[in-house]
């Protein structure tokens, strides 16, 4: 007789979970020398071990200490990009400009990215079919605790000038619920940053506005600023030749604003 | 080229009021934060207000019941209105642009015009 | 308000010197400090902010350092251009508060 089973409103666990995280760590820790130490088998014991056999809805930032200690990695911390809303342009930004790094360059990012997981409370069991969704379910869900947590420790070590890429295009181009706007922006320390700048993103191609006038972006701008944190804005009118830039910055066409 | 201009500076006998104007070119007071600087003759510099983009205002607590800052984003003018003027208010007053949007340091600054308070 | 102290208030040295002006805060101020040049009758000119960034178009011979409460401002080889008054300011709280200035001129 099948077990009864919790049906929830999100998708279930992404198909060979177990196998993509560990197969993503032993890449990972190939390409980067500085992470070669870690031992992947213990990684992915410390993943499952945050929400296996754990009620999917109870899920808190100490259940993923063990793992955060084993993927405990120091990148440079004046070289931090944010983003919201805009993962695929912030990726491309950093293949290109490889001193600089969004929370997917770093292992625990890496593993986790575009993945979802959950248990059940009192089995064993990967729960495949469904997992709680953020808004209909649950906030304390196994993937939204495990974004809060990394994202948190990501935003506390940076320093100098944090960069965050914006997406010009959404109706709210910095909004409070995202994870930057609810967890990122809040655990950046004033004590180690200087200045937050926003790059904001243009969708179109004869889109000439300034977006850094945007409401959200002066709220941004509010937030940052009542924490002793500069804030500077910018317009990226033309992603496409922004990247071509960053690519090759010596281009005669780069002088002008991109 | 940015440019910052002030002007309203004079001679002003104690308890009166002035107004100071800072006119700038080659950058928008909507992207930019403003602050008024003074110097009194021969001494060091005291920052005095800001004003940042979007209007809302910063002072120095020894100012703040006798000073406004204000600004006219349409004619590129950011204003120091000084009440109750006294012989220590004599110095130099800088307006200066914020070096980024929302920056506390001050990276082009006007040549001052010199407020003389004596009766 | 946060007090800057700098010192020296004057110095008189050779071109080509190496000049370094301190500046002390009563308080950690994370580096929240930028340097300023005045030459007579002039406005004050942002020379290095954050402690040890130096602006676009300055020259290299000035350099800064410092972290904590203590910060170091340094002209590694003095020039006749040089002569002036250097003041450091920190942002790190309003009122943003300026040292008193260290006056340098050429023995």
């Known amino acids: 007789v099948p077990r009864w089973r919790q049906q929830w409103s999100g998708p279930g666990t992404t198909k060979r979970f177990p196998e993509t995280v560990l197969a993503r760590c032993v890449k990972y820790t190939e390409i980067h020398p500085e992470m070669r130490h870690v031992d992947c088998q213990s990684v992915w014991d410390a993943f499952k071990g945050a929400f296996i056999s754990k009620h999917p809805c109870n899920i808190t930032e100490e259940d993923y200490q063990p793992l955060m200690k084993l993927g405990t990695q120091t990148v440079p911390c004046n070289k931090i990009l944010l983003w919201s809303r805009i993962k695929d342009l912030a990726h491309q930004f950093t293949q290109v400009q490889r001193d600089m790094f969004t929370l997917e360059d770093t292992l625990l990012g890496y593993l986790a990215d575009d993945l979802t997981w959950c248990g059940e409370f009192n089995t064993s069991k990967i729960n495949y079919q469904s997992c709680p969704d953020w808004r209909k379910d649950c906030s304390n869900n196994p993937v939204s605790v495990f974004w809060k947590t990394v994202s948190r420790r990501f935003a506390e070590a940076a320093c100098d000038v944090v960069h965050v890429m914006l997406n010009g295009s959404r109706s709210k181009i910095f909004d409070k619920n995202s994870t930057f706007g609810s967890v990122e922006v809040h655990n950046l320390q004033p004590e180690k940053v200087q200045t937050l700048e926003a790059w904001v993103i243009h969708g179109g191609r004869e889109d000439s506005r300034d977006l850094c006038q945007d409401p959200t972006i002066k709220e941004l701008e509010s937030i940052i600023s009542k924490r002793n944190i500069q804030f500077s804005c910018k317009n990226i009118y033309r992603p496409d030749k922004f990247l071509q830039c960053v690519k090759n910055p010596e281009d005669s066409s780069c002088t002008s604003e991109i | 080229e940015v440019q910052l201009v002030e002007s309203g500076g004079g001679v002003v006998q104690p308890g009166r009021s002035l107004r100071l104007s800072c006119a700038v070119s080659?950058?928008?007071?909507?992207?930019?934060?403003v602050h008024w600087v003074r110097q009194a003759p021969g001494k060091g510099l005291e920052w005095v207000a800001v004003?940042?983009?979007?209007?809302?205002?910063d002072y120095n607590a020894a100012f703040m019941s006798r000073f406004t800052i204000s600004k006219d984003n349409s004619k590129s003018t950011v204003y120091l209105q000084m009440n109750s003027l006294r012989a220590e208010d004599t110095a130099v007053y800088y307006c200066?642009?914020?070096?980024?949007?929302?920056?506390?340091?001050?990276?082009?600054w006007g040549q001052g015009t010199l407020v003389t308070v004596s009766s | 308000d946060i007090q800057m102290t700098q010192s020296p208030s004057s110095l008189s040295a050779s071109v080509g010197d190496r000049v370094t002006i301190t500046c002390k805060a009563s308080?950690?101020?994370?580096?929240?400090l930028a340097w300023y040049q005045q030459k007579p009758g002039k406005a004050p000119k942002l020379l290095i902010s954050?402690?040890?960034s130096l602006e676009t178009g300055v020259p290299s011979r000035f350099s800064g350092s410092g972290s904590g409460k203590d910060y170091t401002f340094t002209i590694s080889s003095l020039q006749p251009e040089d002569v002036a008054t250097y003041y450091c300011?920190?942002?790190?709280?309003?009122?943003?508060?300026f040292g008193q200035g260290t006056k340098v001129e050429i023995k």
């Open positions: 300011q920190q942002f790190w709280n309003t009122p943003w508060t």
């Open positions: 954050g402690a040890t």
């Open positions: 308080e950690d101020i994370y580096n929240r």
């Open positions: 004003i940042w983009r979007g209007g809302s205002a």
């Open positions: 080659g950058f928008s007071l909507l992207s930019y934060g």
């Open positions: 200066a642009k914020s070096m980024i949007t929302t920056g506390f340091t001050l990276d082009y």
